[in-house]
Interface confidence: medium
Amino acid sequence: HKCDITLQEIIKTLNSLTEQKTLCTELTVTDIFAASKNTTEKETFCRAATVLRQFYSHHEKDTRCLGATAQQFHRHKQLIRFLKRLDRNLWGLAGLNSCPVKEANQSTLENFLERLKTIMREKYSKCSS
């Protein structure tokens, strides 16, 4: 069942992402969940992917995030790799070409990912029951 495979992959990636703090997980992103009423599930996934893409495009080479130690550098590279994987899977789940994201409320990346994990876990429990 395609839904399960994609969702499992997303949840697995989110678990990895939320396990470890890096220099840049406290940077802020647009909180698309703050005003998600009247928004379809596909739109939510599409907007989440857009926000993540904006984040890693902007911060992939950010010197603050890359850090000054080998460990910090490795953790940031890992973060970006996971975000790209998550972005790809969310686009697949959304099935939309693009979606608008209004620069409104802000959330830290780590809170954004935790919220997304909750939504995905809820979806998975419905999907598998």
């Epitope: 406290e26 940077l27 802020t28 647009t30 904006q54 910090q72």
Partner: nanobody, 116 residues
Framework: EVQLLESGGGLVQPGGSLRLSCAAS????????MGWARQAPGKPLEWVSW????????YYADSVKGRFTISRDNSKNTLYLQMNSLRAEDTAVYYC?????????WGQGTLVTVSS
């Protein structure tokens, strides 16, 4: 409204020390990573240091490593930058910063001049 107010800049001799402070308001300071950047005349903005909310993880540019120390007091909503062994090349306007989405929110800056 987010406000970042830097203080502590001034004129200092080479080898001297300064401590910069940044008073933050308008957001939950303890939840966010904060940092210092600087801009010397005719040069691009350079990240100097960054610190996560708990203070356990820090970043320093190679040019200041071992001389500058970033710290924060979450109970006072204040960010600090202790600058020791200052050099002429440290002369710049120092900005306190908070990341805001794809943009960074800056204070007005405080001028640090290292000269004999």
């Amino acid at each position: 409204e987010v406000q970042l107010l830097e203080s502590g800049g001034g004129l200092v001799q080479p080898g001297g020390s300064l401590r910069l402070s940044c008073a933050a308001s308008g957001f939950t300071f303890r939840n966010f990573g904060m940092g210092w950047a600087r801009q010397a005349p005719g040069k691009p903005l350079e990240w100097v240091s960054w610190i996560i909310s708990s203070g356990t993880e820090t970043y320093y540019a190679d040019s200041v490593k071992g001389r500058f120390t970033i710290s924060r007091d979450n109970s006072k909503n204040t960010l600090y930058l202790q600058m020791n062994s200052l050099r002429a090349e440290d002369t710049a306007v120092y900005y306190c910063a908070k990341s805001l989405g794809r943009f960074d929110y800056w204070g007005q800056g405080t001028l640090v001049t290292v000269s004999s």
